[in-house]
C-alpha cells in the first residue's frame, strides 16, 4: 500500500496529516508531532509514533525465561528526540535536564543523569520476547494453528520478514513470541522488530495504529484470541548499565 490517492490517508499510520502536495500532486503524509514525512507502505518508526502520541490531545512448549539483562519498559510514555531517519537518539532528556540513554526501541538502559551524561551509540535491541496471557477458552488453542496465525500476522500485517520471528511458545494460557534481528541481519527495507512489536502491542491493547476500524481481531480457527495481559522484554546487543542499587531494588 501507498498513501491512498482517492482520499489521501496513510494506511499504516493514523497519526499523520496527509495532503496531495507531493510530487505530481501525489498524496504525502507527515507524522504528527515531528512533521516528518513517512512512508505509508511500511510501518512508521516507534520514535515518530511516540512523538505523535505525545503531541495528540490527551483522552480524559517450554516458555522462555527472560535473561537477567532483559529490559521492561517501566518508564512509560515520554516525548522522545528522533534523528532525521526517525530513530531514537541515543540520549534522551526531559524538560528538567534529566537525561538517560536508550536502546533502539527507546527503552531506558542506564540510570538517569544530568546533561553531562554521555551515550556514545544507539545500542540495538536484537531480541524481543512478547509474553501474552490469553483469556480462558473452552480448550487450549492448537499450538501449530496458533504458531501459523501469529507468524502470518507478523508477516502480513506488520510486514516483518518471517526469518525474524524466531519462535512461538505456548503453555496455556501463556503465549510467547520471540523476535530476533541482529544488526548484520537487517537489510535495507526490512521492518525493525522493535517497530513490529510496538504496532502489535498497540493492536493488542485495542489502540490500533492502522487506518481503519480501530481494532485487531486475531482468530485461531475462528476463535478470537483475547489477550488479558502483555509483557514485553527487550534484550540489547550490549547489556544495559544500571547501578547495583537499581539491580537489587
Amino acid at each position: 500500500h501507498t498513501a491512498a490517492q482517492d482520499n489521501c490517508t496513510c494506511p499504516t499510520n493514523k497519526m499523520t496529516v496527509c495532503s496531495p502536495d507531493g510530487p505530481g500532486g501525489r498524496c504525502q503524509c507527515r507524522a504528527l508531532g515531528s512533521g516528518m514525512a513517512v512512508d505509508c507502505s511500511t510501518l512508521t518508526s516507534k520514535c515518530l509514533l511516540l512523538k505523535a502520541r505525545m503531541s495528540a490531545p490527551k483522552n480524559a512448549r517450554t516458555l522462555v525465561r527472560p535473561s537477567e539483562h532483559a529490559l521492561v519498559d517501566n518508564d512509560g510514555l515520554y516525548d522522545p528526540d528522533c534523528d532525521p531517519e526517525g530513530r531514537f537518539k541515543a540520549r534522551q532528556c526531559n524538560q528538567t535536564s534529566v537525561c538517560w540513554c536508550v536502546n533502539s526501541v527507546g527503552v531506558r538502559r542506564t540510570d538517569k543523569g544530568d546533561l553531562s551524561l554521555r551515550c556514545d551509540e544507539l545500542v540495538r535491541t536484537h531480541h524481543i520476547l512478547i509474553d501474552l496471557r490469553h483469556r480462558p477458552t473452552a480448550g487450549a488453542f492448537n499450538h501449530s494453528d496458533l504458531d501459523a496465525e501469529l507468524r502470518r500476522l507478523f508477516r502480513e500485517r506488520y510486514r516483518l520478514h518471517p526469518k525474524f520471528v524466531a519462535a512461538v511458545h505456548y503453555e496455556q494460557p501463556t503465549i510467547q513470541i520471540e523476535l530476533r534481528q541482529n544488526t548484520s541481519q537487517k537489510a535495507a527495507g526490512d521492518v525493525d522488530i522493535g517497530d513490529a512489536a510496538y504496532y502489535f502491542e498497540r493492536d493488542i491493547k485495542g489502540e490500533s495504529l492502522f487506518q481503519g476500524r480501530g481494532g485487531l481481531d486475531l482468530r485461531v480457527r475462528g476463535e478470537p484470541l483475547q489477550v488479558e495481559r502483555t509483557l514485553i522484554y527487550y534484550l540489547d546487543e550490549i547489556p544495559p548499565k544500571f547501578s547495583m542499587k537499581r539491580l537489587t531494588a
Epitope: 502470518r152 500476522l153 491493547k205 492502522f210 476500524r213 481494532g215 480457527r221 478470537p224 483475547q226
Partner: antibody, heavy 119, light 112 residues
Framework: QVQLQESGPGLVKPSETLSLTCTVS????????VNWIRQPPGKGLEWIGV???????NYNSALMSRLTISKDTSKNQFSLKLSSVTAADTAVYYC?????????????WGQGTLVTVSS | DIVMTQSPDSLAVSLGERATINCKSS????????????LAWYQQKPGQPPKLLIS???SRESGVPDRFSGSGSGTDFTLTISSLQAEDVAVYYC????????FGGGTKVEIK
C-alpha cells in the same frame, strides 16, 4: 477494487448436492477469508460457514454434516457444497469477504445468487 | 451458540424523526482485553446485499451518514437513526462475531 461474484445452477433437485462458486478479485486469497451467508425468500440472514485466510474452516453447526467449503487459489475461487438439499435450502446465497484482522465484519459482498430446490 | 434477538420486528417512523432498534445477545460480546464489542450493524435494501454500517458496536464505516450511530456494550446494543430519511427504508440486522457469527432476525424500518 474488491469484487465477489457468486455463480452456480439456479435449480437443484431435492436430495442432490448444491454447488456454488465465489470468484473474487482485488485481493489475495491468502490474506482474506470468505464467508457464505444465505437468505430464504422474505426471511432473515443465516451465516453458513467461512474459509479463513489461513485455510481452516468453520461451519454453522446446524449445517455442518452436509457442508464443505474449499478454495482454489490459482483460480481465485471459493466453493460451497451442500449435500442432501431440501426445499428449506431454497435461498439467495451470498459470499462475503472477512476483513481479516480488522474485525470479522463483512464489508464486501457479492450480489447473491438465487438457488431453488424443487423437483 | 450465541442467540441474537432484535426488537422490534418492524418500525414505522415519520420522516425526520428518530428510529431506535435494539439488539440483545445471549452472552457478552465484550473483549475485556481491548474493551471492544464484537457487534456489527448491517442495512439491507430490497434486491441488494447487506451493507456494513457499524463495526465494533459503535464505529461508523466510512461513507455512512452521521445520522446513524451505534451504542451499547456487553449484551445490549442499539442502532439509532437520529433523523429518518426516505433512503433509510430498509431491513437492519445486528451480527455478533464473538463466537463465529450469528445475525439477529432483522428489523424492518418504514415511513409512517
Amino acid at each position: 477494487q474488491v469484487q465477489l461474484q457468486e455463480s452456480g445452477p439456479g435449480l437443484v433437485k431435492p436430495s442432490e448436492t448444491l454447488s456454488l462458486t465465489c470468484t473474487v478479485s482485488g485481493f489475495s486469497l491468502t490474506s482474506y477469508g470468505v464467508n457464505w451467508i444465505r437468505q430464504p425468500p422474505g426471511k432473515g440472514l443465516e451465516w453458513i460457514g467461512v474459509m479463513w485466510a489461513g485455510g481452516s474452516t468453520n461451519y454453522n453447526s446446524a449445517l455442518m454434516s452436509r457442508l464443505t467449503i474449499s478454495k482454489d487459489t490459482s483460480k481465485n475461487q471459493f466453493s460451497l457444497k451442500l449435500s442432501s438439499v431440501t426445499a428449506a435450502d431454497t435461498a439467495v446465497y451470498y459470499c462475503a469477504r472477512d476483513e481479516n484482522w480488522d474485525g470479522a465484519w463483512f464489508a464486501y459482498w457479492g450480489q447473491g445468487t438465487l438457488v431453488t430446490v424443487s423437483s | 451458540d450465541i442467540v441474537m434477538t432484535q426488537s422490534p420486528d418492524s418500525l414505522a417512523v415519520s420522516l425526520g424523526e428518530r428510529a431506535t432498534i435494539n439488539c440483545k445477545s445471549s452472552q457478552s460480546l465484550l473483549n475485556s482485553g481491548t474493551r471492544k464489542n464484537y457487534l456489527a450493524w448491517y442495512q439491507q435494501k430490497p434486491g441488494q446485499p447487506p451493507k456494513l454500517l457499524i463495526s465494533w458496536a459503535s464505529s461508523r464505516e466510512s461513507g455512512v451518514p452521521d445520522r446513524f450511530s451505534g451504542s451499547g456494550s456487553g449484551t445490549d446494543f442499539t442502532l439509532t437513526i437520529s433523523s429518518l430519511q426516505a433512503e433509510d427504508v430498509a431491513v437492519y440486522y445486528c451480527k455478533q462475531s464473538y463466537n463465529l457469527f450469528t445475525f439477529g432476525g432483522g428489523t424492518k424500518v418504514e415511513i409512517k
